[in-house]
């Protein structure tokens, strides 16, 4: 068995029997742990720059008689690559520069083996190589460039951002990784807390409108900031964000715009803009008309993109009524920050003068449409009525009138070009056309381009100039065996006229047929009449056909009447009164047709 060399131990602690002895750059001072003593540690300085391999230490078995019978074997982290062992002597060397920040601890296992038999002379022994830190790493910020924002006008000491630098060196040993922050650029506006890296505002009333961007350079230095420490820097780009600390202001107190009187409602007539040094929603402006004679005539809307106030026409303008309007327009911030209200009202007003420009307008008729009436029996050149149009402009240019011939192709009407009197130029007939729709044109004499039109609706009034007549052609029959006073036909009449109180027709046999007639007419007083038999029985061989002349009269003024003929045939009928034959026997009564009813 082998024991760890007592000479290197701190006196006063018991020796623990060990198979392998570790000697060299080991720290064999015992550090007390709960279960055992830790002595199997080598310490190796990182970043060794010597020309030879760095000596780590020696493994030795007490069974080693120095005759080469034992072979020392190393396994574990970096064995055979970073760490090599002389298999005969047990000397361990590091072959490369070691970087603690890459790997701070290597755990290896050592064994002494009988070179001939391969038999281990004692159990495998584990040991640790700890890489001793040197200050070879500067603090590195987590970002090369930080971006941060803080509201303008913030109180001194307002948090802006925290920067963090990390140092890869050992934080548990010395001050190699103890980082202190300082500000290299950015005073007196900002400060940094040396321990935490928190950047705060350091100056009162930092105004974005004065300066928006700040570039702050922060240094992180290890060794607690002392001389010889390594350092790194970062840039912090700080932007002051806007707060509403500026009211809108009109650059001028009065604006003047012109608009033609013909501008329809909604027409933009001008733009006004209040400037606001703020940005974003803090620079949003609402415009309103607060006063002035144009309050009802104009509107103001806000263009959300340009933050301009657009003055628009609200109602129709009339140069002849009012030529100039004065408005008071107010610009205000909708988003107000209460803490800045002490700076004054966040609104401004300006006077807007709107000049209405005269437009040469066409003549205006006194009515939008004219409805006229004329009797259908009116003579040519009868005056129906008149139209009136006036030039609305201040000039009051004279107008002339004409009929649009496209609407009166038959030239039934005419107009006096001077006074607008409408008269007939042809005879009318209500029964042909009840309404005549024509268009009259009024044209400024001095400016024929300025014209306007108006519709004329002319109603033709009825005159009783048509006689009533049968509604249809009547041809009826009578049975030979008919009885007296039997109804054989009902008559109806029509009249093209349209009397105010309705039609009232009267029916009678013509005077020449009234005496000795075989039939009678019975007026029903409801604009119908019936034909009745006057005797019992008719002989078709004696008289096969009767022609009855019927006089129909109306009761209008002047009375109109006409005579219509009803044909009555004598027929042979069955006992139900159904017609069987209406043909006269030929040769017997060659003169079968008679007008004598």
């Amino acid at each position: 068995t082998l024991s760890t060399p007592l000479s290197k131990r701190t006196s006063g602690f018991p020796a623990k029997k060990r198979a392998l002895e570790l000697s060299g750059n080991s720290k064999n001072e015992l550090s007390r742990s709960k279960r055992s003593w830790m002595w199997n540690q080598f310490f190796l300085l990182e970043e060794y720059t010597g020309s030879d391999y760095q000596y780590v230490g020696k493994l030795h078995s007490d069974q080693d008689r120095g005759d080469g019978s034992l072979k020392y074997i190393l396994s574990g982290d970096g064995a055979g690559d970073l760490f090599i062992i002389n298999e005969n002597t047990g000397d361990i060397q590091a072959t490369k520069r070691l970087d603690r920040e890459e790997k701070p601890v290597y755990i290896l296992r050592a064994q002494a083996i009988n070179r001939r038999t391969g038999r281990p002379v004692e159990p495998e022994s584990e040991f640790i190589i700890k890489i001793h830190d040197i200050n070879d790493n500067e603090p590195i910020f987590t970002k090369e460039v930080y971006t941060a924002t803080v509201p303008e006008m913030s109180d001194v000491g307002t948090f802006v951002v925290q920067v963090t630098a990390t140092d890869a060196d050992d934080p548990t040993y010395g001050n190699s990784a103890k980082v202190v922050y300082s500000i290299l650029q950015g005073q007196p506006y900002f400060s940094v807390e040396s321990e935490t890296g928190i950047i705060k505002t350091a100056l009162l009333n930092m105004d974005r409108e004065n300066r928006e961007q700040y570039q702050v350079v922060i240094q992180a230095k290890d060794m607690g900031g002392q001389m010889g420490g390594l350092s790194g820097t970062t840039t912090v780009n700080i932007t002051l964000t806007d707060v509403n600390d500026n009211p809108p202001r009109f650059p001028q107190s009065t604006y003047q715009f012109k608009t033609p009187e013909s501008s329809p409602p909604g027409t933009p007539i001008g733009r006004i803009k209040a400037s606001d040094a703020d940005v974003g929603e803090n620079a949003e402006i609402e415009y309103s008309i607060t006063d002035g004679e144009g309050l009802d005539m104009f509107d103001v809307i806000t263009d959300q993109e340009t933050q301009e106030g657009i003055i628009t026409v609200k109602k129709l303008l009339d140069f002849e009524k009012k030529k100039v309007y004065t408005l008071k327009v107010e610009a205000s911030n909708p988003h107000v920050e209460p803490r800045f209200l002490y700076l004054g009202p966040f609104k401004d007003s300006a006077t807007v003068r709107i000049v209405v420009e005269d437009v040469d307008e066409p003549p205006v008729f006194s009515k939008l449409a004219y409805i006229l009436q004329i009797r259908e029996d009116a003579q040519i050149n009868t005056t129906i009525g008149s139209v009136t149009a006036q030039d609305p402009d201040a000039a009051r240019n004279p107008v002339k009138y004409s009929v649009d011939r496209h609407t009166d192709m038959d030239r039934i009407f005419n107009i006096d070009s001077g006074n607008g009197s409408i008269f007939t130029s042809k005879l009318l007939d209500r029964e042909t056309l009840l309404w005549h729709n024509i268009t009259v044109i009024a044209t400024e004499i001095n400016n024929p381009k300025q014209s306007s039109r108006v519709p004329l609706y002319i109603k033709v009034l009825d005159v009783n100039d048509n006689a009533p007549e049968f509604a249809e052609f009547y041809e009826t029959f009578v049975c030979e065996k008919a009885k007296a006073d039997q109804l054989i036909q009902t008559l109806r009449a029509v009249d093209k006229d349209d009397p105010y109180s309705g039609h009232q027709f009267s029916f009678s046999l013509a005077p020449e047929a009234a005496s000795g007639s075989n039939f009678t007419i019975q007026d029903n007083k409801d604009n119908t009449a019936g034909i009745l038999t006057r005797k019992n029985g008719y002989n078709r061989h004696e008289m096969s056909t009767y022609l009855l002349p019927v006089v129909i009269s109306d009761n209008d003024y002047p009375v109109q009447s006409s005579t219509g003929t009803v044909t009555v045939r004598v027929c042979a009928c069955d006992h139900h009164g159904n017609m069987q034959s209406c043909h006269a026997e030929a040769l017997i009564h060659p003169t079968g047709l008679s007008t004598g009813a």
Epitope: D67, G68, S69, G118, P120
Partner: antibody
């Protein structure tokens, strides 16, 4: 590369002795052991013993204590095994080999010993 | 002396199949996690060739179809898949103590 060279055959009479050679090359002769192994025709393998050329120290199979003597000549990187009082039982193939941590990683081609009158 | 018993004495395996050879030691050949058992292949007229050392470590240049396992007294050599050229006699050997001893051998035939 490591090589162990042995003569192909030896023919000897009973009762006499024979000294077999094994010439090593391709490694540091004095740093590793040389072992000898016997194999009778159609039989298994028997370890005779080994020698450490760096010191001349030997390990023997007790069965061969009075039969085999192991020596080295470090100047010629050659190991020798002398077999004495030969009988027909000694007729076999004798291999030299390098024992590295208990395993024979390199072997000679073997010398066939025939003991016959 | 430590006696090594190999089984079977011979076996015939089809091409591509698995061959398993066992070696039992009369006492443990393991110490401190190291198993001092080694395996060799010998073809007629040739010296033995090291295949596996320390029970399970493949010697450089030996095909990966050879594998070893075991500890204490029981050890196994596996060949899978078996190839034509694997026809030979296989020996186990211990180096735990002097004298080093070999197993009696297992002859592998390919069907």
């Amino acid at each position: 590369q490591v090589q162990l060279q042995q003569p192909g055959a030896e023919l000897v009479k009973p009762g006499t002795s024979v000294k077999m050679s094994c010439k090593a090359s391709g490694y540091t002769f004095t740093s590793d052991w040389i072992a000898w192994v016997k194999q009778r025709p159609g039989q298994g393998l028997e370890w005779i013993g080994d020698i450490y050329p760096g010191s001349g120290r030997t390990h023997n199979n007790e069965k061969f204590n009075f039969k085999a003597t192991l020596t080295v000549d470090t100047s010629s990187n050659t190991a020798y095994m002398q077999l004495s009082s030969l009988t027909s039982e000694d007729s076999a193939v004798y291999f030299c080999a390098r024992p590295m941590l208990g395993r024979f990683d390199y072997w000679g081609q073997g010398t066939t010993l025939t003991v016959s009158s | 002396d430590i006696v090594l018993t190999q089984s079977p004495a011979s076996l015939a395996v089809s091409l591509g199949q698995r061959a398993t050879i066992s070696c039992r030691a009369s006492e443990s050949v393991s110490i401190h996690g190291t198993h001092l058992m080694h395996w060799y292949q010998q073809k007629p007229g040739q010296p033995p060739k090291l295949l596996i050392y320390a029970a399970s470590n493949l010697e450089s240049g030996v095909p990966a179809r050879f594998s070893g396992s075991g500890s204490e007294t029981d050890f196994t050599l596996n060949i899978h898949p078996v190839e034509e050229e694997d026809a030979a006699t296989y020996f186990c050997q211990q180096s735990f103590e002097d004298p080093f001893t070999f197993g009696s051998g297992t002859k592998l035939e390919i069907k």
